[in-house]
């Protein structure tokens, strides 16, 4: 899996003349690093069947790092899928042609040399082009632990055709019970997509109190179906001598 130099690398050399390597000196070791992290920001790829998927992890390091790929955390071999796949070492990419539903999963690039290792995971979903249920990026929203009085941002990345309805909910207790008479959990609607909701995929909580600890749910629906993922917020109090007096008001189910 040895790699040639990345064609994404810059040729600029900022080192001084004294630092430049001569025939008998070794270059300074550099642990692997991403050369174009902005090209890796799109983690969820929802792709119609039969299309080609290209995941890239442009990197550099000294000595040249190696590149390998995992699927769902396990070694990914070409014979694991019909038609195999291509790894383009010069562009730090993996290409899978003619995707099928069994290609769904998480694909992780691992870039390493003797001085370090970095990795990045892409999520692939193979979808019908016709209307389908919403798809949520794995790992979002993410659990948060913050200090009392902080601001918190939960994010939910959604792929949906048709237009989805996004709700942010919080699990609450009513009269000491988390479950209602209909056997469904009590929830409070904090935010939903609509005329007055800009950026419905983000929930921001300001100046959080201990009462706001708990489970937050991103619920996305369209007329085909729905999907939801949740995260936990833990609000920690400062040490006793630093503890401010905070008045908390109860939350009520809407």
């Amino acid at each position: 899996d040895a790699l040639p130099s990345s064609e994404d690398d810059d040729d600029d050399d900022d080192s001084s003349s004294e630092e430049k390597e001569t025939d008998n000196t070794k270059p300074n070791p550099v642990a692997p690093y991403w050369t174009s992290p902005e090209k890796m920001e799109k983690k969820l790829h929802a792709v119609p069947a039969a299309k080609t998927v290209k995941f890239k992890c442009p990197s550099s390091g000294t000595p040249n790092p190696t590149l390998r790929w995992l699927k769902n955390g396990k070694e990914f071999k070409p014979d694991h899928r019909i038609g195999g796949y291509k790894v383009r070492y010069a562009t730090w990419s993996i290409i899978m042609d003619s995707v099928v539903p069994s290609d769904k999963g998480n694909y992780t690039c691992i870039v390493e040399n003797e001085y370090g290792s970095i990795n990045h995971t892409y999520q692939l979903d193979v979808v019908e082009r016709s209307p389908h249920r919403p798809i949520l990026q794995a790992g979002l929203p993410a659990n948060k632990t913050v200090a009392l009085g902080s601001n918190v941002e939960f994010m939910c990345k959604v792929y949906s055709d048709p237009q989805p309805h996004i709700q942010w909910l919080k699990h609450i207790e009513v009269n000491g019970s988390k479950i209602g008479p209909d056997n469904l959990p009590y929830v409070q609607i904090l935010k939903h997509s609509g005329i007055n909701s800009s950026d419905a995929e983000v929930l921001t909580l300001f100046n959080v109190t201990e009462a706001q600890s708990g489970e937050y749910v991103c619920k996305v629906s369209n007329y085909i179906g729905e999907a939801n993922q949740s995260a936990w917020l833990t609000v920690t109090r400062p040490a006793l001598e630093e503890r401010p007096a905070v008045m908390t008001s109860p939350l009520y189910l809407e």
Epitope: D8, K39, H45, V47, P48, A49, A50, K51, T52, K54, K56, K86, R88, T91, I95, D97, S98, V100, E128, R129, S130
Partner: antibody, heavy 116, light 109 residues
């Protein structure tokens, strides 16, 4: 080997509907491919019109979407194009093609002229 | 929508190397495919997935793709290579296919 053959009228009147069919022989239309239509006005470049998967999923060029319908008939192993409200600007050679990410197989093309 | 930009024409002497470019925003993240079309004929795929050749296509045809430019390279150009060449991608953002405007390759002499 798989072959594609376009058929349909070579002359359509303005404001009428252009209708073409592509027969797939030597293979199944239910394979993991998209079945596409591409056109080329005289002396100009290629323009993707749209495509269909055997399940019925479709995708259309946004500039033509309001006028285009592509359908598939699995029992006859063929797919069809309908383009409504045509004008002289729709005069072109129309190709049907098989695609994954790329077009690996093309019909020979059929010239459709829009004229009264 | 996604736009692919090609030079309208490229001229090259026989035996030389022709390079046809296809520009697009961050096109290196997409898979680029190239077609050759001769007058009165349907297009023929000559390169797919940036740099792969279908069977039957001479090794003289090669491709590369990085940054904002993909390139089709034809080495040791022959008179029979004279044709129009089109790049194409499936734009994963809009879920549409896009062709470049085409480049007419003229073999001099």
């Amino acid at each position: 080997q798989v072959q594609l053959q376009e058929s349909g009228p070579g002359l359509v009147k303005p404001s009428g509907t252009l209708s073409l069919t592509c027969a797939v022989s030597g293979g199944s239309i239910s394979s993991n491919n998209w079945w596409s239509w591409v056109r080329q006005p005289p002396g100009k470049g290629l323009e993707w019109i749209g495509e269909i998967y055997h399940s019925g999923s479709t995708s259309y060029n946004p500039s033509l979407k309001s006028r285009v319908t592509i359908s598939v008939d699995k029992s006859k192993n063929q797919f069809s194009l309908k383009l409504s409200s045509v004008t002289a600007a729709d005069t072109a050679v129309y190709y049907c093609a098989r695609a994954t990410d790329w077009f690996d197989l093309w019909g020979q093309g059929t010239l459709v002229t829009v004229s009264s | 929508s996604y736009v692919l930009t090609q030079p309208p024409s490229v001229s090259v002497a026989p035996g030389q190397t022709a390079r046809i470019t296809c520009g697009g925003n961050n096109i290196g993240s997409e898979s680029v495919h190239w077609y050759q079309q001769k007058p009165g004929q349907a297009p023929v795929l000559v390169v797919y997935d940036d740099s792969d050749r279908p069977s039957g296509i001479p090794e003289r045809f090669s491709g590369s793709n990085s940054g904002n430019t993909a390139t089709l390279t034809i080495s040791r150009v022959e008179a029979g290579d004279e044709a129009d060449y089109y790049c194409q991608v499936w734009d994963s953002t809009s879920d549409h296919r896009v062709f470049g405007g085409g480049t007419k390759l003229t073999v001099l002499g």
